[in-house]
């Protein structure tokens, strides 16, 4: 058993039929010695008396908020949560496996630049009695500070018969060094509590590996005289690291016909303009990627040819 | 050329070669997200590689103030990786394919390090750790780790030379 926060404790249980469970001793936080009774959750049924209560925690029925009282007055509370371990593996019932980029990916994170700011998100089908708490650091043995905000519900989607909820959190490295080569990964730890079930999820990454620039901005077409060619121009996204002479992007320009089956013409360039042939009913799209490190491409920015 | 005492390197040449190094490093080990090498334990093998750290002056301001600190750190790293790529980690079993980019990568590391430090001038270099994995699978894993680490190192070096070429070239 360990303390998650004040008056909230996590009991780690091996979860199998007829498991012995864990013996837990709760102590009433009071100078009083006599006339103390204990109750659990939303009930007046007395579970024991005395300054301490010894319970054998085996199932979710044994978890919950234990309260000690004297003469009708509440003295203190202890909330017990359960963390299940099945076949040596901690349960992952609360969050959905996103399966990208690999199986058992519960947390996904992205950064728009090298400033040390990043966003992580996760999915669940649970809609109520759900709380998250996020901590992060650079490295684990001698951790350096990363500050995370509160996790918030960022999207709701309908997937077949189920509703899916996306939560996200923004974090910022306290003393970020955008130009340095990272040697210690960022560690992100999410505590999830659903009713009386506790689970924790972790992700470890370098900012450089989760970079995904915003799409190029101000995408414009300039027709060239006496030609089917157009000059496409764009700018670096506002959110990208500066100076651009140091934090450079490379770009992919694509001409796509109306039909998905039509052949796509692609040009790669380090410049912020390119000359392409604009077909009727086609559209021109541009996306960006770090020039020197192959992290994710941005989403496409698009304009119609006409 | 970056002479230990002072003059500027051939920024544009260094920029071109470092960008080529980036391309080669990624073609040598393209499968990025599919193998999280940090999960594979064995940390000590890649802990000793030289990293371009915050105080090394490789940021735009540091380069403007005095690029020598940064160039020296890059040079150390290039020599270190060049030695690693020439070691039995890469020459031993399992043999690299004949058209493997590792050979070109090795030559380009050497080329860039010579651009930064011509014969006769010596910056102190970092001692290469004695890594001689016994099993072929250990060697393969170590190659992946080294290439992964090299990708991060040459990305920073390429940024330095691109910025230098754009803002510090005479």
């Amino acid at each position: 058993i360990w303390e998650l926060k004040k008056d909230v404790y996590v009991v780690e249980l091996d979860w199998y039929p007829d498991a012995p469970g864990e013996m837990v001793v709760l102590t009433c936080d009071t100078p009083e010695e006599d006339g103390i009774t204990w109750t659990l959750d939303q009930s007046s049924e007395v579970l024991g008396s005395g300054k301490t209560l010894t319970i054998q925690v085996k199932e979710f029925g044994d978890a919950g908020q234990y309260t000690c009282h004297k003469g009708g007055e509440v003295l203190s509370h202890s909330l017990l949560l359960l963390h299940k371990k099945e076949d040596g593996i901690w349960s992952t019932d609360i969050l959905k496996d996103q399966k990208e980029p690999k199986n058992k990916t519960f947390l996904r994170c992205e950064a728009k630049n090298y400033s040390g700011r990043f966003t992580c998100w996760w999915l669940t089908t649970i809609s109520t009695d759900l709380t998250f708490s996020v901590k992060s650091s650079r490295g684990s043995s001698d951790p350096q500070g990363v500050t995370c905000g509160a996790a918030t519900l960022s999207a709701e989607r309908v997937r077949g018969d189920n509703k899916e909820y996306e939560y996200s959190v923004e974090c910022q490295e306290d003393s970020a060094c955008p130009a340095a080569e990272e040697s210690l990964p960022i560690e992100v730890m999410v505590d999830a509590v659903h009713k009386l079930k506790y689970e924790n999820y972790t992700s470890s990454f370098f900012i450089r590996d989760i970079i995904k620039p915003d799409p190029p901005k101000n995408l414009q077409l300039k027709p060239l005289k006496n030609s089917r060619q157009v000059e496409v121009s764009w700018e670096y996204p506002d959110t990208w690291s500066t100076p651009h002479s140091y934090f450079s992007l490379t770009f992919c320009v694509q001409v796509q016909g109306k039909s998905k089956r039509e052949k796509k013409d692609r040009v790669f360039t380090d410049k912020t303009s390119a000359t392409v042939i604009c077909r009727k009913n086609a559209s021109i799209s541009v996306r960006a990627q770090d020039r020197y490190y192959s992290s994710s491409w941005s989403e496409w920015a698009s304009v119609p040819c006409s | 050329r970056a002479v230990p005492g002072g003059s500027s390197p051939a920024w544009t040449q260094c920029q071109q070669l470092s960008q080529k190094l980036c391309t080669l490093a990624w073609s040598a080990h393209p499968l990025v997200g599919h193998m999280d090498l940090r999960e594979e334990g064995d940390e000590e093998t890649t802990n000793d590689v030289p990293h371009i750290q915050c105080g090394d002056g490789c940021d735009p301001q540091g380069l403007r103030d005095n690029s020598q600190f940064c160039l020296q750190r890059i040079h150390q790293g290039l020599i270190f990786y060049e030695k690693l790529l020439g070691s039995d980690i890469f020459t031993g079993e399992p043999s690299l394919l004949p058209d493997s980019p590792v050979g070109q990568l090795h030559a380009s590391l050497l080329g860039l390090s010579q651009l930064l430090q011509p014969e006769g001038h010596h910056w102190e270099t970092q001692q290469i750790p004695s890594l001689s994995p016994s099993q072929p699978w250990q060697r393969l894993l170590l190659r992946f780790k080294i290439l992964r680490s090299l990708q991060a190192f040459v990305a920073v070096a390429a940024r330095v030379f691109a910025h230098g070429a754009a803002t510090l070239s005479p």
Epitope: G21, T37, L40, D41, Q42, S43, S44, E45, V46, L47, G48, I55, Q56, V57, K58, E59, F60, G61, D62, A63, G64, G72 | -
Partner: antibody, heavy 112, light 107 residues
């Protein structure tokens, strides 16, 4: 003296609505669980649900069929659309499986 | 939560020992009570918290058990002990279930 007394039983037609009342005296409702338990003629005891500090909790089989509510001195049990299977003696109890257990005498409901 | 109570009925002579068992479908961590009910009366609490004797109950009644298995033992049964006995278990406080009952007859 601490006691509970059920009222409101009697003959009811199927589909009609019926509310039983448990009146408590000698103790405060806010301090205890008040349970409703029923017993069909010649059958065993069946727990319906309870209320504690205004929050009701029900047996799975009873959800939607019964509504438990409270005022400062009474606890109500509303039987929605009773059928013949709801014919039983209905008891209210203070607590069930620890100290301070107290049962009312019960009230008979006949659905016919 | 299902409480399986055995036997459904038993017959004993005065002075015999009667044993009634109750098995919960899930661990109920001693949140268990035993009741005695005689015809035309509300049930009377005998044992609570699996083994604590309720006030005014003769000491021949004894409760034991933990987890999912519980027992009520009547040592030296008396004529006035003829009644139906019920166990009641509680999983997570908010889920409570009675056993089906055991009818005890005195020969």
């Amino acid at each position: 003296q601490e006691q509970l007394k059920e009222s409101g039983g009697g003959l009811v037609t199927p589909g009609g609505s019926l509310t039983l009342t448990c009146t408590v005296s000698g103790f405060s409702l806010s301090t205890y669980d008040i349970n409703w338990v029923r017993q069909a003629p010649g059958k065993g005891l069946e727990w319906i649900g309870y209320i504690y500090r205004g929050s009701p909790y029900y047996a799975d089989w009873a959800k939607g069929r019964f509504t438990i509510s409270s005022t400062s001195t009474t606890v109500g049990l509303k039987i929605t659309s009773p059928t013949t299977v709801d014919t039983a003696t209905y008891f209210c109890t203070r607590n069930l499986y620890s100290v301070n257990v107290l049962w009312g005498p019960g009230t008979l409901v006949t659905v016919s | 939560l299902v409480m399986t109570q055995t036997p459904s009925s038993t017959s004993a002579a005065v002075g015999d020992t009667v044993t009634i068992k109750c098995q919960a479908s899930q661990s109920i961590s001693s949140r268990l009570a035993w009741y005695q009910q005689k015809p035309g009366q509300p049930p009377k609490l005998l044992i609570y918290s699996a083994s604590t004797l309720a006030s005014g109950v003769p000491s021949r009644f004894k409760g034991s058990g933990s987890g999912t298995d519980y027992t009520l033992t009547i040592s030296g049964v008396q004529r006035e002990d003829a009644a139906t006995y019920y166990c009641l278990g509680s999983y997570s406080n908010t889920i409570r279930t009675f056993g089906a009952g055991t009818k005890v007859e005195i020969k």
